[in-house]
């Protein structure tokens, strides 16, 4: 069943077929007997009861009132009574845009990340059974969509979707065609959950080292899910039995990004692995971010500053 | 609209340097990183290199180490693959596009080296 | 480098018949910390750029139909067009992302029987 019409405030559109609808329908089925009645007000006139001798274009069934359409006159407040029960409504009818398929104040927005799933669903379940057909338009140009009843779009968004998309539904009422149109501004945006990322720490790091010790090289940045880290060095990696890449370490942060970390253990270090670069590249769909890492003997280590140490 | 516009065609001779632009509009440009590949006439498709538009950072490809520049200008959304010491084997269709799956292409610019 | 080998390097089909191209990385392009394949297909036309299809092994593009799909994973991997149309007809090439230089397969090339 067609929910009530809770909202206080509802702005329509001239020519449309328009309902409201009291939100204690299923009370007033079972106090059958109870007298229901609904009333307009409007500038100078106080609670005029409707019903419908009031006007041709008005429809009165167990729980609404409708419009067959709603034209500019029709704006004013509207109030439901029944025994205790009040209910009001404050009506705008606004004009039709004659030089468009839709009106603009009535457009609902909604922003969708490209690649990211999108979906319009042409439906008016109220006039369902009434509906001959329906169209769907993309800036006032016909969609050629399979079904004609329920037109839908479903697919992962891509920039070029972007814009108003217009649901127009034909329906025949008392021999009379109308059309109820309901439009979307879809605005299509880059994926907002994505960051650059970040190597953490300083970008050029010497390390003090002895010749026939071990010693561990840390790279840590905050990446995205799909975001890559990993070690390069020498001419292909690898070559070197001495030098090792750990499992790379992740944890999920709370903005749902990531901080990873990966071990580069170089055993026994030769005169080999001195003054030579160590790379760790972090890559992404943005480019990459590089940090090196250059061991040094001890013994030569007054020759740099002490800035420029990692320990 | 999404897309990648790049400069005209050029004919060089052998030594020469080529310039090609390539413009982006209808995203945010520092998003991806634009990667340039080439197509000799009637082969597969070369892997040239890549800059990082958010921190200009480059990685080309080994056999074109020293002879190809990678630039972007952030202030007109545009990146820029330079090429010199231009030999007849750089004939090519020369193509910019964006992010490391390449979803998004320019038409291409047909570079002829010929004396 | 990683080395892309594409198989085979042409393909007759019939139309309406199933087209099965593969592609073979010489190192693994699976990135065991997200479990994700750095690898994508490509179709290019005569005269036109390159058109993505595929990304992550078996993500389709959008806009992409449904009769193209991806799989496989770490070095193994497979485009299948599930019935073959005619405006298919293509060089189809594969390409990994996984460490630079990004590396494309040698291209195949689909016709029809």
């Known amino acids: 069943a067609e929910s009530c019409t809770s909202r206080p405030h509802i702005t329509v559109v001239e020519g449309e077929p328009f309902y409201l609808k009291h939100c204690s329908c299923s009370l007033a089925h079972e106090i059958e007997t109870t007298t229901k009645s609904w009333y307009k007000s409007s500038g100078s006139q106080e609670h005029v009861e409707l019903n419908p001798r009031s006007s041709s274009r008005i429809a009165l069934h167990d729980c609404v009132l409708e419009f067959w359409p709603v034209e500019l006159n029709d704006t004013g407040s509207y109030f439901f009574q029944m025994k205790n029960y009040t209910q009001k409504w404050k009506l705008n009818v606004i004009r039709r845009n004659k030089h468009s398929c839709f009106t603009e104040r009535q457009v609902t927005s909604k922003i969708v990340e490209v690649k990211k799933f999108f979906q319009i669903t042409c439906e008016n379940s109220y006039y369902q059974t009434l509906v001959n057909s329906t169209s769907l338009y993309k800036n006032c140009k016909k969609l050629l969509l399979e079904n004609n009843k329920n037109p839908t779009i479903k697919k992962n968004a891509e920039f070029e979707d972007q814009g108003y998309y217009s649901c127009v539904h034909f329906l025949h009422h008392n021999g009379k065609l109308f059309n109820i149109t309901k439009t979307f501004n879809i605005t299509i945006v880059e994926d907002r959950s994505n960051i650059v990322p970040v190597l953490l720490g300083p970008k050029l790091n010497h390390v003090a080292v002895e010749l026939g010790k071990n010693v561990r090289l840390n790279c840590s940045a905050l990446l995205n899910e799909e975001d890559v880290i990993y070690w390069m060095f020498g001419e292909e990696n690898g070559s070197d039995p001495n030098i090792h890449e750990e499992k790379e370490m992740r944890i999920m942060t709370p903005e749902g990004k990531w901080h990873a970390s990966k071990v580069l253990r170089i055993e026994n270090i030769g005169e080999s692995n001195l003054n030579v670069l160590y790379n760790c590249t972090v890559a992404s769909t943005g480019g990459t971010d590089t940090k090196s890492f250059i061991l040094v003997r001890k013994a030569d280590m007054a020759d740099i500053p002490g800035h420029v140490f990692t320990r | 609209q999404v897309q990648l516009v790049q400069s005209g065609a050029e004919v060089k001779k052998p030594g020469a340097s080529v310039k090609v632009s390539c413009k982006a509009s209808?995203?945010?440009?520092?998003?991806?990183?634009i990667s340039w590949v080439r197509q000799a006439p009637g082969q597969g498709l070369e892997w040239m290199g890549w800059?990082?538009?958010?921190?200009?950072?480059?990685n080309y490809a080994q056999k074109l180490q020293g002879r190809v520049t990678m630039t972007t200008d952030t202030s007109t959304s545009t990146a820029y693959m330079e090429l010199r010491s231009l030999r007849s084997d750089d004939t090519a269709v020369y193509y910019c596009?964006?992010?490391?799956?390449?979803?998004?292409w320019g038409r291409g610019t047909l570079v002829t080296v010929s004396s | 480098d990683i080395v892309m080998t594409q198989s085979p390097d042409s393909l007759a089909v019939s139309l309406g018949e199933r087209a099965t191209i593969n592609c073979k990385s010489s190192?693994?392009?699976?990135?065991?910390?997200?479990?994700?394949?750095?690898l994508a297909w490509y179709q290019q036309k005569p005269g036109q750029p390159p058109k993505l299809l595929i990304y992550?092994?078996?993500t389709r593009e959008s806009g992409v139909p449904d009769r193209f799909s991806g799989s496989g994973s770490g070095t193994d991997f497979t485009l299948t067009i599930s019935s073959l149309q005619a405006e298919d007809v293509a060089v189809y090439y594969c390409?990994?992302?996984?460490?630079?230089?990004?590396?494309f397969g040698q291209g195949t090339k689909l016709e029809i029987k």
């Open positions: 992550w092994s078996s």
């Open positions: 390409q990994q992302y996984y460490r630079t230089p990004y590396t």
């Open positions: 800059i990082s538009v958010y921190n200009g950072n480059t």
């Open positions: 596009t964006r992010g490391w799956y390449f979803d998004l």
């Open positions: 209808g995203y945010t440009f520092s998003s991806y990183g």
């Open positions: 190192q693994t392009v699976l990135y065991s910390s997200n479990n994700k394949n750095y």
